[in-house]
């Protein structure tokens, strides 16, 4: 699985990585002005786990299981 993955929050992450086989999902999250793009585990694609792992109380997130599916426009749909 390929995901956009930037180590630190960035407005427009364009770094694509081949996720390790442990990861079966891509995540994009917006918390305030912070946008996170990550390789993720689908079992953690729920509000509680995303907020806990990102130390953010309010956010919007989108998980998907296709290559490079975690781009900004997904959060606007």
């Amino acid at each position: 699985l390929q995901c956009y993955n930037c180590p630190n929050p960035t407005a427009d992450c364009k770094t694509a990585v081949n996720c390790s086989s442990d990861f079966d999902a891509c995540l994009i999250t917006k918390a305030g002005l912070q946008v996170y793009n990550k390789c993720w585990k689908f079992e953690h694609c729920n509000f509680n786990d995303v907020t806990t792992r990102l130390r953010e109380n309010e956010l919007t997130y989108y998980c998907c299981k296709k290559d490079l599916c975690n781009f900004n426009e997904q959060l606007e749909n």
Epitope: N5, P7, S21, D22, F23, K41, E43, N48, R53
Partner: antibody
């Protein structure tokens, strides 16, 4: 304050079994992945197991696969490591560690003080 | 499995020195690299993750850099409490592996 307290170590004969426990406090245990890492006397660090927050996924290196089983009881805030068919090379201090620092998987930000397992006849 | 190789295995330095420790991965791990410090008889302490992000409470004299396969941990001005063993660890995915460690000793 985050605290991880390991117990259950001791002397065991080759081929024997042991169950380690790690009691967690000071954080929402059920929301965090956890790992066990060991360190043989005078040697470096070796990761031995991982379990996701809900227990749905576990991972092991080949050196312990099939012999060690990681589990957790989120109602008791406790992590376990069941070790079977123990070998002399399993002798080490075993640390439990909280996994998942910020948005990262497999980064361990809090560690217990360790429990010593000695495998010897 | 991804192999992590640290160099040097040991290093003597003095208080105030600038010190660099190197870690090399056997394959591309992007920026998925962490550094830990361990003092004798103590548990490891997280210093850096994502190759260059300092963990909470870590002094700014520590810095990490690199991506892909080659990484460094730099201590800009050694303090007495920095004499310890340092380990790198990739966090790209399981199995997790550590470098063999670099023991930093007082000259």
């Amino acid at each position: 304050e985050v605290q991880l307290l390991e117990s259950g170590g001791g002397l065991v004969q080759p081929g024997g079994s042991l169950r380690l426990s790690c009691a967690a406090s000071g954080f929402a245990f059920s929301s965090y992945d956890m790992s066990w890492v060991r360190q043989a006397p005078g040697k470096g660090l070796e990761w031995v197991s991982y379990i996701s927050s809900g227990g749905g996924s576990t991972h092991y290196p080949d050196t312990v696969k099939g012999r060690f089983t990681i589990s957790r009881d989120n109602s008791k805030n406790t992590l376990y490591l069941q070790m079977n068919s123990l070998r002399a090379e399993d002798t080490a201090v075993y640390y439990c560690a909280r996994d998942g620092y910020y948005a990262e998987y497999y980064v361990m930000d809090y560690w217990g003080q360790g429990t010593l397992v000695t495998v010897s006849s | 499995d991804i192999q992590m190789t640290q160099s040097p295995s040991s290093l003597s330095a003095s208080v105030g020195d600038r010190v660099t420790i190197t870690c090399r991965a056997s394959e591309n791990i992007y920026s998925y690299l962490a550094w830990y410090q361990q003092k004798p008889g103590k548990a490891p302490k997280l210093l850096v993750y994502n190759a260059k992000t300092l963990a909470e409470g870590v002094p700014s004299r520590f810095s990490g850099s690199g991506s892909g396969t080659d990484f460094t941990l730099t201590i800009s001005s050694l303090q007495p409490e920095d004499f310890a063993t340092y380990y790198c660890q990739h966090h790209y995915g399981s199995p997790l592996t550590f470098g063999q460690g670099t023991k930093l000793e007082i000259k």
